[in-house]
């Protein structure tokens, strides 16, 4: 969030000075909140970082994230027969990504037009709420998925309705929790008109009063409760999973599973390293510096980290790919422009030819799309 220092210096970051002057009006005394933007803040708001780099990244995220997560949600809801807990968590992950990504055209237009928000305050609040909501939803659903993957290895019992119901319950609880923790983002006034630049910013300029006290406390709480704790759970699940896979007996099938598990771990690790850790760390550091020193020296890094956090919508489909056989099939066929039905028919015809040539019977498992959980 940009703020302007009351020093006329370049290369410093950004504080929103609030003038607490009371103005007596006919209706009584009102306090006007002032949003300070100085030379440096103004140059960030008009510079290449926010008007070129950000829209490029958001365009990539939108172009990749929308179709891949859209397809994933469709596969998990309509093309996966058994709704295992993993499927439920991935469906929610895809939904969270979609709810964030669908607003990206507005975000892209906002940055391209010099950080000028023309779509009204309500839409700005929705965009910001969904932006942060997606990040924290992704962390929590990824944690659930990671713990569930470990649980399957430890406890390889068959699918039960009860397990699916528990997963649905946990998912609903996560959505409710995220809705509650993002309420401040919907309540706070996010659009600010900057006369000198003739622009209305969305979330990029906030008053110092709110920022110094509340924003630091808010993002620190989220970083501990909705990032660090789930991150610890995720890491623990994968460490234990690696141990289990190492000690397990090795056949061709379990070797494939192990490779996929390692790919999944690497993908989730990449997501934490690229998306979640930098953004959560810099959110706290940025607001701490403003709170303690009155200025932040990490503003550019903070901007980049928040931008990179949206890449989770592009990385999530790789998670679906390594976990879900159904998604793998549909993804491969989508990329090869083939339908799953055509592939199935080809598999059936191949199987029947084998049957006619040889007297020995074959298992027709190739005709059904398996799901590896």
């Amino acid at each position: 969030t940009i703020q302007g220092t009351n020093r006329s210096s370049k290369g410093r970051s950004l504080i929103g000075k609030v003038d607490g002057t009371s103005h007596v009006t006919g209706k009584g005394v009102t306090v006007e909140t002032v949003f300070s933007v100085d030379e440096f803040s103004a140059s960030v708001l008009t510079g290449k970082l926010t008007t070129v780099f950000l829209p490029i990244v958001y365009t990539i995220v939108f172009v990749v994230g929308l179709p891949s997560n859209g397809m994933a949600l469709w596969v998990f809801l309509f093309r996966t027969k058994k709704k295992h807990p993993a499927v439920i968590y991935m469906a929610n992950l895809a939904l969270a990504d979609l709810l964030s990504v669908i607003w990206f055209p507005l975000k892209i237009a906002y940055h391209i037009h010099g950080n000028n928000w023309i779509y009204g305050e309500a839409l700005c609040n929705v965009l910001i709420g969904f932006f942060y909501g997606n990040m924290y939803c992704s962390i929590l659903f990824m944690t659930c998925l990671s713990v569930q993957r470990y649980w399957v290895i430890v406890n390889p019992m068959g699918h039960s309705r009860k397990k699916a119901n528990i997963a649905i319950g946990i998912s609903l609880a996560i959505w409710l929790l995220i809705l509650l923790v993002t309420i401040p983002l919907y309540v706070v006034k996010q659009t600010i008109f900057i006369p000198a630049l003739n622009i209305t910013t969305c979330h990029d300029v906030l008053p110092e009063q709110l920022l110094v006290g509340d924003m630091f406390n808010y993002f620190l709480s989220l970083a501990i409760g909705v990032f660090l704790f789930p991150a610890f759970l995720t890491a623990s699940a994968y460490v234990l999973m690696i141990r289990m896979l190492r000690s397990s007996a090795m056949d061709e099938n379990s070797e494939k599973k192990r490779k996929r598990a390692i790919k999944l771990i690497v993908t989730v690790l990449a997501m934490y390293l690229i998306c979640f850790t930098p953004s959560n760390l810099l959110l706290v550091v940025h607001y701490f510096l403003i709170k303690s020193q009155g200025q932040s020296h990490v503003y550019a890094l903070y901007i980049v980290a928040l931008c990179l956090s949206t890449l989770n919508s592009c990385i999530d489909p790789f998670v679906y790919y390594f976990v879900s056989h159904d998604f793998r099939d549909h993804a491969k066929n989508a990329l090869l422009c083939r339908s799953v039905r055509t592939v199935k028919q080809m598999q059936v015809s191949l199987t029947s030819k084998k049957h006619s040539r040889k007297s020995s019977s074959y298992s027709s498992s190739s005709t059904t799309v398996k799901t590896s959980y």
Epitope: G4, E32, S36, G47
Partner: antibody
Framework: EVQLVESGGGLVQPGRSLKLSCVAT????????MTWIRQAPGKGLEWVAS????????YYPDSVKGRFTISRDDAKSTLYLQMNSLRSEDTATYYC??????????????WGQGTLVTVSS | DIQMTQSPHSLSASLGETVSIECLAS??????LAWFQQKPGKSPQLLIY???SLQDGVPSRFSGSGSGTQYSLKISNMQPEDEGVYYC?????????FGGGTKLELK
């Protein structure tokens, strides 16, 4: 001490061009927005053009848009105003001012002594 | 464009007297208002910005107030050096516009 010294004014015929300069000293020039403000003889003040510290954004009123161009050379700590298609109503003393961007707006803190531009045939 | 209307057009005050100059904007300018003083043959000087913030080096006898569309500059304890023309200016919407000026003279 902040100093702004304008030059380039003089008598010019309508339709002709003129370029004003403003040399800035006593501060780090590329840290600040700059503007030109004019004052017709015996009249009030009129804002003419603004430029951001990066030089990437410029702002003009409709009365001069398309005719006047504000620019800066940070290496020379100099502000320019290129005036084309001059009209008699452009006759004024042109002031170069250093802007303070604060509370999200422009405040004209330091002013030069001005340079007189007379547009007459 | 936002029109800035100053009143009175001119006024004279005695030494030590308190004077007020009014400025009316054609629409709300959210306190984005500055006051300038211009002495004969000199460049204008910023006195007040953001309606009520005193610019560094300006005597405390100058004060600004107002909100919405109505703003005023008060000079308490009038001094000889306070003679000149006073302008208000809005910094809320491009183009920045000035009031027509108020000429203050010493009686």
């Amino acid at each position: 001490e902040v100093q702004l010294v304008e030059s380039g004014g003089g008598l010019v015929q309508p339709g002709r061009s003129l370029k004003l300069s403003c040399v800035a000293t006593g501060f780090t020039f590329n840290n600040y927005w700059m503007t030109w403000i004019r004052q017709a003889p015996g009249k009030g003040l009129e804002w003419v053009a603004s430029i951001t510290n990066s030089g990437g954004n410029t702002y003009y009123p409709d009365s001069v848009k398309g005719r006047f161009t504000i620019s800066r050379d940070d290496a020379k700590s100099t502000l320019y105003l290129q005036m084309n298609s001059l009209r008699s109503e452009d006759t004024a003393t042109y002031y170069c001012t250093r802007v303070r961007v604060y509370y999200g707006s422009n405040w004209f803190v330091y002013w030069g002594q001005g340079t007189l531009v007379t547009v007459s045939s | 464009d936002i029109q800035m209307t100053q009143s009175p057009h001119s006024l004279s005050a005695s030494l030590g007297e308190t004077v007020s100059i009014e400025c009316l904007a054609s629409e709300g300018i959210s306190n984005y208002l500055a006051w300038f003083q211009q002495k004969p043959g000199k460049s204008p000087q910023l006195l007040i910005y953001y309606a009520s913030s005193l610019q560094d080096g300006v005597p405390s006898r100058f004060s600004g107030s107002g909100s919405g569309t109505q703003y005023s500059l008060k000079i308490s304890n009038m001094q000889p050096e306070d003679e000149g023309v006073y302008y208000c200016q809005q910094g809320y919407k491009y183009p920045w516009t000035f009031g027509g000026g108020t000429k203050l003279e010493l009686k």
